[in-house]
């Protein structure tokens, strides 16, 4: 009897298996999340497993199908959108991806009142963006770079803009650089809260240099893809913001919103638009040298039918130690008085925190404080403010949801999530219904993800929305690697790391080490999240130790760490990876003759520089779609951190920080360079230049290109990529196939 548990344990161990590469490539252990599509304070829509669109009422506990899978299938719909008056649903089909967020699609409007598709005045195709007004069933859409308005789905459209032109003028949608580096959306139009006005951006790319690359396809001659793409120091898009009255669009036509004088005096960006009321709007602007941001609150003047942005309603945010904001400048969340707002920015100690601005930024009231950071404001109601932070137990890679009672004085703070499922859940996001009556919590780990529904008043859990039971069962016989998150203290710098260890890890043995690096400004790799991915397989099956390290330049640990890389990209990020590797060697279980590093995108840049650091630490490494010179990358991103590539600014460091400048140092490492030829983001040019420099230096290296693949190397290329990288690493580490 005493021995039995041991026998059971042994037999269990025998039935358990390591992860295989096939598991990873097939997505066998992928998880599901549940984000309710809120349509009121107590109702949400969700697409069921059999593709019916179901409306759930939390208070009555009832649910009913508003749109059948038959209707969805009749137009091959892959997405839907219910009009706020619940009379119509748009169905989206023929999805065709463009860039990261943008895509075109065909849209059909289904009339719920008569159970038929709307006939007459059908929408043109393909449409670049379409959305309902926040109230009723007006439609705004972008077709061929112009904006159209429909009072109702069956009505003829009203054309708002006429100057839209492919690759020249973009109305209501961003150009490449604004989509990728500023707005992070596929749209650039915004309805006012009750649908009275429609604001939109116009981007003029006429003078922007064009990146051109071949798309090989299947034809006799390759196509050439042309994208207006401003690289560092190049001419940028010219942006203008307009607002049109959607009831009387022809009355005075689109009215331009004035740019603050201190912004308009030199090159600038528009960064975001937030409606406050139907007649008050807040615009955020940023100087091209991105350390000055201006938030401008504008009011509608009925008598002149114009938008007035008084200087007294301009709020300046300036950074003296780096760039403005984190990755982006934060957006305001307005309170019920429609003039004061809550916003995250650096406090005097250099930590990003929530501030309440009533009149001026100088008089801002700090709402949160401490040596941690507030990360996102989810919702402000009459009496509560919900936000996320990494305060709990001083782990920067966690996210918990907090509620501050702003209705009472002094405001009290409560952590909503900290103790819910403490072992399983340390990284949350949330989704709130109208007036925060209810909310969903989505936990990403470190355990198996789980989504739950909660009462917004009491925080009581109402039900589990998704707990990934099938995944849990599937993992029962899998030998998953062990994970630990710890920190290193080196020269007054805290380096957090995540280590992924083989299942039967033994500290007395020696293991090959793979560093996975991203390391870009304001990024975070060491997070308490669940993942079964390629590196999980490498630890589980191939017995490697994998480490991720957040060095200088990474986020959510204060401005000192974040802004350390300002104007000096490619220096400290690399140093900190090297420092961490040395510390890992000191731990005694790393085989120092078998250390590799790999990264993608910014991580490809860092891994390349680390391999070429001349330390002799790395035996081999992989760079996937790396940046090789900051002169080749997008202006908005690059200049934020590096300034301009001009003699009187920062040209010297632009030149010093290239991978090509270190070509000679690759001689003593095995280097695998990988890139997609149709990468619209980090152009193939980057790898082409690395390869040229290595050839010119007569340095041997390995390379793989993926024809017609973009920065994501998706589809069959993904399988080929990870198989190829696995072979490379196993060869490097002398592991048998």
């Amino acid at each position: 009897i005493v021995l039995r548990p041991s026998r059971v344990h042994n037999s269990e161990e025998n039935t358990m298996r390591a992860l295989t590469l096939k598991d990873i490539l097939n997505g066998t252990f992928s998880y599901k999340t549940f984000f309710p599509n809120w349509i009121s304070g107590q109702e949400y829509l969700h697409q069921s497993a059999d593709n019916n669109i179901v409306l759930y009422n939390i208070e009555t506990g009832q649910s009913y199908t508003i749109l059948s899978n038959r209707t969805m299938k009749s137009v091959n719909a892959s997405n839907y959108g219910l009009s706020p008056d619940r009379q119509f649903v748009y169905l989206e089909s023929d999805y065709s991806k463009l860039w990261r967020y943008s895509y075109t699609a065909t849209y059909y409007i289904y009339d719920l009142s008569n159970g038929e598709f709307v006939r007459g005045n059908e929408l043109p195709r393909p449409i670049q963006y379409l959305c309902w007004s926040p109230v009723g069933s007006k439609l705004a859409y972008v077709y061929q770079n112009n904006i159209y308005l429909k009072q109702r789905p069956g009505d003829p459209p009203f054309q708002i803009t006429f100057n839209g032109r492919e690759n020249k003028i973009f109305n209501g949608i961003p150009d490449w650089v604004y989509e990728e580096e500023m707005l992070a959306t596929k749209y650039a139009l915004w309805w006012s809260p009750n649908g009275k006005f429609l604001a939109y951006a116009e981007f003029n790319d006429t003078d922007i240099p064009v990146i051109a690359y071949s798309y090989y396809g299947d034809e006799q001659y390759p196509r050439t893809i042309n994208i207006p793409y401003p690289k560092a120091g190049a001419k940028n898009p010219v942006v203008r913001i307009f607002i049109i009255d959607t009831t009387y669009p022809a009355y005075v036509g689109p009215q331009e919103v004035p740019v603050p004088a201190m912004i308009a005096s030199s090159d600038y960006y528009f960064s975001w638009l937030t409606w406050v009321t139907d007649e008050r709007v807040c615009l955020q602007w940023l100087k091209r040298v991105q350390n000055v941001s201006v938030l401008s609150i504008c009011d509608f003047r009925e008598d002149w039918q114009t938008w007035d942005c008084p200087k007294t309603q301009e709020h300046i945010e300036e950074s003296r130690t780096g760039w403005a904001g984190g990755f982006f400048v934060s957006t305001p969340v307005f309170s019920y008085d429609a003039i004061s707002y809550y916003k995250i920015f650096s406090d005097k100690d250099g930590y990003k925190h929530i501030h309440y601005i009533k009149d001026t930024v100088e008089n801002a009231i700090q709402i949160t404080s401490g040596k941690w950071e507030a990360i996102n404001i989810f919702r402000v109601t009459q009496d509560s403010l919900f936000y996320s932070s990494n305060e709990f137990e001083e782990y920067p890679g966690r996210r918990n949801i907090y509620r501050i009672s702003i209705g009472s004085y002094p405001p009290s703070k409560k952590c909503v999530t900290c103790h819910l499922r403490k072992e399983r859940c340390q990284y949350y996001t949330a989704s709130f219904s109208d007036y925060a009556k209810y909310y969903a919590l989505v936990c990403y780990g470190p355990g198996i993800p789980i989504s739950t529904l909660h009462d917004g008043r009491t925080d009581q859990e109402i039900k589990i929305l998704e707990e990934n039971k099938e995944l849990e069962n599937a993992l029962k016989n899998i030998q998953l690697p062990k994970e630990e998150i710890k920190k290193l203290e080196v020269d007054e710098i805290t380096l957090w790391y995540k280590m992924i260890l083989p299942p039967q890890f033994d500290r007395s043995k020696k293991y090959p080490l793979l560093i996975q690096v991203y390391g870009g400004p304001c990024s975070q790799s060491v997070r308490s999240v669940f993942a079964v991915n390629w590196i999980s397989y490498l630890a589980s099956k191939e017995g490697m130790v994998i480490a991720l390290v957040d060095g200088r330049g990474t986020a959510f640990q204060g401005d000192k760490l974040l802004y350390a890389v300002y104007r000096k990209l490619g220096v400290y990020e690399v140093e900190d990876q090297i420092t961490a590797v040395r510390k890992f060697i000191e731990m005694g279980f790393i085989d120092e003759k078998r250390i590799a590093i790999w990264g993608w995108s910014y991580g490809g840049y860092v891994s390349s520089l680390a391999l070429a650091s001349g330390t002799g630490l790395f035996k081999c490494g992989i760079a996937v779609a790396p940046v090789s010179s900051w002169e080749y990358y997008a202006s908005v991103y690059t200049e934020r951190f590096m300034g301009l590539p001009t003699k009187d600014d920062n040209l010297e460091h632009y030149k010093n920080s290239t991978v090509m400048a270190r070509a000679e140092y690759f001689r003593n490492v095995d280097y695998l360079l990988i890139h997609g030829t149709a990468d619209d983001n980090v152009h193939f040019q980057n790898s082409a230049q690395i390869a040229k420099a290595l050839v010119n230096a007569q340095v041997d290296f390995q390379a793989m290109w993926y024809s017609d693949q973009n920065h994501g190397l998706s589809g069959l290329s993904t399988n080929h990529l990870y198989t190829h990288m696995t072979h490379f690493l196993k060869q490097c580490f002398s592991l048998s196939d």
Partner: antibody, heavy 118, light 107 residues
Framework: EVQLVESGGGLVQPGGSLRLSCAAS????????MSWVRQAPGKGLEWVSW????????GYADSVKGRFTISRDNSKNTLYLQMNSLRAEDTAVYYC???????????WGQGTLVTVSS | DIQMTQSPSSLSASVGDRVTITCRAS??????LNWYQQKPGKAPKLLIY???SLQSGVPSRFSGSGSGTDFTLTISSLQPEDFATYYC?????????FGQGTKVEIK
Amino acid sequence: EVQLVESGGGLVQPGGSLRLSCAASGFTFRGYIMSWVRQAPGKGLEWVSWISPEGSRTGYADSVKGRFTISRDNSKNTLYLQMNSLRAEDTAVYYCARLQYGTWFDYWGQGTLVTVSS
Amino acid sequence: DIQMTQSPSSLSASVGDRVTITCRASQSISSYLNWYQQKPGKAPKLLIYAASSLQSGVPSRFSGSGSGTDFTLTISSLQPEDFATYYCQQATLLLPTFGQGTKVEIK
């Protein structure tokens, strides 16, 4: 099917009053700008007045300003035109029309004749 | 107010003819120009909106063009049912005004 049906026309003496009605059906009345357009016998079309979807904003031609009042009852899907201080030159067929986007008249009623004569 | 001037005020044409009516605004009205057809004793009917968009159900022989101040209505091949009076109309500043009309008669 969109339908607009005017009523209330007739013979009235100069200086008199008349109230025209327009019953709307076949569309979401409360969502549209509505308008009155008139046509004097043998003449062209002349816009008279418009009213916003919720009824808070109105517009009038100079020729009727201060004498005519446009209104609507969204619960009854009905548009009205109150005509006071009528003059001989107000004699016309009065059409009720939907003013799409405040820009074009996409649906018209059959019209009602108003005759101002002593 | 913006004045709309139509020309000609009347024209005679035969079935199958290509007919062109022009409309000039006293100042720029962008593309906010519409065309209507009216037959005796009937209400006007919208043909073209926003200078060039064909109203649903209107035959494709009708087309519109122009922007700014000069606009054109074209009937590519006149049909018997097309003999009527045609009006242009603008609506900037929420003050709609009509042209004086063009009567198309049988030659």
